[in-house]
């Protein structure tokens, strides 16, 4: 197991949360483990208990403060350790010097709403949640629309290469039920990844007027 495929992956949501996943082949499910955060230039330390999410995978969230507080900056380094109890002592299983703004994953966009809907198009807006003001406008979005008879995986991705919190979907079919999702990613960070997809927004296009197509 020591030479197995263990992984220790963490992401910063850009404000006050570091989420970590620890996976360890051959580990006992009831092993008690935690993540400890030790910043290089802050007075606080933080710990969270790793809870099982699958057979050999555990996760936890380091809550650094109020959700919208800016707890870390681009110059911060946070040493993250996985500690597991072995008998009466804690054993260090993994260590990394974590650069928060190189490992970003924002919260999923929220407050999706239909601004205007017609027979063939729909204008949708959303908001970003708990995103640092440091990004200014340096964000990008991906969106997808679920059409009847298709899966999310089949939906083509629409890319918005700027901080644009709305989209106008076109060439839709009249009187049809759709679902829409969006996700966000900062441009900054070597290991930065996409946010989770937003909760789906369901909407229905208007029926075509009798005798004409609007």
């Amino acid at each position: 197991a020591v030479n197995g495929t263990s992984q220790f992956t963490c992401f910063y949501n850009s404000r006050a949360n570091i989420s970590c996943v620890w996976s360890q082949d051959g580990a006992l499910q009831d092993t008690s483990c935690q993540v400890h955060a030790w910043p290089d230039r802050r007075r606080w330390n933080q710990t969270c208990e790793l809870l099982p999410v699958s057979q050999a995978s555990w996760a936890c969230n380091l809550i650094l403060g109020a959700p919208d507080s800016q707890k870390l900056t681009t110059v911060d380094i946070v040493t993250l350790r996985v500690l597991c109890r072995e008998g009466v002592r804690w054993r260090v299983m993994a260590i990394q010097d974590f650069k928060p703004f190189e490992n970003l994953r924002l919260m999923a966009p929220i407050s999706l709403q239909v601004v205007h809907v017609e027979t063939h198009r729909c204008n949708i807006s959303w908001e970003i949640s708990q995103a640092s003001h440091y990004f200014e406008r340096h964000l990008e979005f991906e969106a997808r629309t679920l059409s009847p008879g298709h899966t999310w995986e089949e939906a083509p991705l629409l890319t918005l290469k700027q901080k644009q919190e709305w989209i106008c979907l076109e060439t839709l079919t009249p009187d049809t039920q759709y679902e829409f999702q969006v996700r966000v990613k900062p441009l900054q960070g070597e290991f930065t990844t996409w946010s989770p997809w937003s909760q789906p927004l369901a909407f229905r296009t208007k029926p075509a007027a009798l005798g004409k197509d609007t």
């Epitope: 197991a1 030479n3 220790f8 040493t79 996985v82 993994a94 260590i95 010097d97 070597e190």
Partner: nanobody
Framework: QVQLVESGGGLVQAGGSLRLSCAAS????????KGWFRQAPGKEREFVAA????????DYADSVKGRFTITRDNAKNMVYLQMSNLKPEDTAVYYC????????????????????WGQGTQVTVSS
């Protein structure tokens, strides 16, 4: 690409000390870990020590714990291995290696995790 060049090896008597250096150049990673491995004649390459990007975390093989110290100087792109109280069984070619993921610890000692390697420097400890 990444280039790693080791130096500082040599012949030393048992109980003596050596300091190995590793100079890194080329592509940089935002938070890599660096480590030292060694390979004695007829044996497999084995983990010796590793250090996190900012040097705030270290990991050592049980066989060298308390005798070897790994440090790094990011301003100079250097990693060092201070070896004290050397034993004949420390005789090997010592390799510097880089792990872009930046995680170290007992479950991260496999050489497969290290993507970039130096050519090695010979350390011989005579009794």
């Amino acid at each position: 690409q990444v280039q790693l060049v080791e130096s500082g090896g040599g012949l030393v008597q048992a109980g003596g000390s050596l300091r190995l250096s590793c100079a890194a150049s080329g592509r940089t990673f935002s938070s890599d870990a660096k480590g030292w491995f060694r390979q004695a004649p007829g044996k497999e390459r084995e983990f010796v020590a590793a250090i996190t990007w900012a040097g705030r975390g270290t990991d050592y093989a049980d066989s060298v714990k308390g005798r070897f110290t790994i440090t790094r100087d990011n301003a100079k792109n250097m990693v060092y291995l201070q070896m004290s109280n050397l034993k004949p069984e420390d005789t090997a070619v010592y390799y510097c290696a880089l792990n872009p993921e930046g995680v170290i610890g007992p479950y991260f000692r496999n050489s497969n995790r290290y993507n970039y390697w130096g050519q090695g420097t010979q350390v011989t400890v005579s009794s």
